[in-house]
Amino acid sequence: SSSLEVLFQGPGLNDIFEAQKIEWHEENLYFQGEPAVYFKEQFLDGDGWTSRWIEKHKSDFGKFVLSSGKFYGDEEKDKGLQTSQDARFYALSASFEPFSNKGQTLVVQFTVKHEQNIDCGGGYVKLFPNSLDQTDMHGDSEYNIMFGPDICGPGTKKVHVIFNYKGKNVLINKDIRCKDDEFTHLYTLIVRPDNTYEVKIDNSQVESGSLEDDWDFLPPKKIKDPDASKPEDWDERAKIDDPTDSKPEDWDKPEHIPDPDAKKPEDWDEEMDGEWEPPVIQNPEYKGEWKPRQIDNPDYKGTWIHPEIDNPEYSPDPSIYAYDNFGVLGLDLWQVKSGTIFDNFLITNDEAYAEEFGNETWGVTKAAEKQMKDKQDEEQRTRRMMRTKMRMRRMRRTRRKMRRKMSPARPRTSCREACLQGWTEA
């Protein structure tokens, strides 16, 4: 069977009050029934993926290949889409039966493995409406949600979570750090109908909260009162000059004075050299600028805080989370160094199912993947050591040869004669 599954398992009306768990969230009534799997792709059928995924028609875009990479936990199960050409844009997408997440949870999940030790490149997915022209998917194509890791230099190692709200891409206000090692990692985004969200990496929560709090979808609830302004007599000075303090009479002394110890050189010629002036020195009695003593300001009122009012432009939106139409999952990326592998894509409405699926895919092969990598690293270390040893041996041999060349020729006599002649070994 195809590894791309599109299933509709909505609740039957007869079962609603028996088998279904009914949850009430603000104005949203929704049913928690059998998991609906809108999209699942594990690349388990060889080249079958090529008929399900569509590439952008542009010759200079990078090619995806099916591969489990240089190391893996299971050579077949860990096969995924791997970027194969450096410094390229990539555009590949798969469509599925369109659905809306209104009144239900949305879970987007996939694995990413940057086995190339990535320097700059995307590892995120975009969810598009089914109106997308897949042959012309590009960076400006309007999407619903963008989610996943992104690395570019030391400054960017983050998980993007971007929602298109009323035609505008809105970025999360939190910084979620992504994994930047060479192993496979599981990324999960959960968006719930109560306008809350959760981001998981490797099936562990790394961020959660409310959509309204963590994105700028809506105008702020409060604004500074435009009719309020600081009263003119509002005194924000904590300290003031002491009006009773006055400068001592002997305070003002020049900063520099002529050096009293300086003497005019004997060979000084006033006609030739002009009038002699002694060099100046720092005046030890100079006290600097006089400043009156500071006292507490009796009129001090503190820092004026601009009062806030309810923002008349704010109104809550209980359906921030909801989209009418999801129909395409796309990889729209740039990679400087290629080698990233994408696998185990899942779009569902069931958090528990997604977690289970993650454990059965990424969870099952992660230990073996690390083992294989460790073994490869060990072998590489051994090879490096062997190479180093060989190099050292060659160097020693070369040095010996050089020494022999440099030392005087040994006389062809017996040892006894040689000793008598006073010849010693070099």
């Epitope: 570019c152 960017t156 035609g167 970025l171």
Partner: antibody, heavy 127, light 107 residues
């Protein structure tokens, strides 16, 4: 934070070309998009084009297409703007400005604004 | 091509709230940035992504954006806020600036 230092003032004859440089320091050059913006005396800001050094490709405002060339040399962390076929209306202060990428896509800088500007280079075109 | 329209000038009394608008077709769907420019100086980014403040920009600067209008609001305006202000957005990989607004602080 990155700092941008531009080359000195230029006086040019109509029909000639000018090449202005913008050297970045104190940041990773490849993590920024560099825009070139000009301002004629008493006028507003006008975007001419930009480049993202890590992607290598430049894009230009339609008005300047064919007359402006923007390049970047990653080895020296320097961006260049060359404007050809100069006319008196090109007399202006030319600024380079950087926007952080904060992502591996060329569109990321759209979100962050031009947060660092060079000091400006005055170009006078006069016969 | 995309056009952003700003009023040429706005006046405000010290301590009062100044509002500078930037009009554009469906500008609410774009990220809008605002720059302050004082005479003889390079522009300075004061608001990005509609309403976020870069570090070092006073709290009195705020922004909003919806429908066909983006707005820069300066509450408790000070004499030092007198400058030219420009809005900017991206359209089809091209940066577009508004014509600029001269803010005059009276008195």
């Amino acid at each position: 934070e990155v700092q941008l230092v531009q080359s000195g003032a230029e006086v040019k004859k109509p029909g000639s070309s000018v090449k202005v440089s913008c050297k970045a320091s104190g940041g990773t050059f490849s993590s920024y998009a560099i825009s070139w913006v000009r301002q004629a005396p008493g006028q507003g800001l006008e975007w001419m084009g930009g480049i993202i050094p890590i992607f290598g490709t430049a894009n230009y405002a339609q008005k300047f297409q064919g007359r402006v060339t923007i390049t970047a040399d990653e080895s020296t962390s320097t961006a260049y703007m060359e404007l050809s076929s100069l006319r008196s209306e090109d007399t202006a202060v030319y600024y380079c400005a950087s926007s952080p990428l904060r992502g591996s896509g060329w569109y990321w800088h759209y979100y962050y604004g031009m947060d660092v500007w060079g000091q400006g280079t005055t170009v006078t075109v006069s016969s | 091509s995309y056009v952003l329209t700003q009023p040429p000038s706005v006046s405000v009394a010290p301590g009062k709230t100044a509002r500078i608008t930037c009009g554009g077709n469906n500008i609410g769907s774009k990220s809008v940035h605002w720059y302050q420019q004082k005479p003889g100086q390079a522009p300075v980014l004061v608001i990005y992504q509609d309403r976020k403040r870069p570090s070092g920009i006073p709290e009195r600067f705020s922004g909003s954006n919806s429908g066909n209008t983006a707005t820069l609001t300066i509450s408790g305006t000070q004499a030092m806020d007198e400058a030219d202000y420009y809005c900017q957005a991206w359209d089809s990989s091209t940066a577009v600036f508004g014509g600029g607004t001269k803010l005059t602080v009276l008195g």
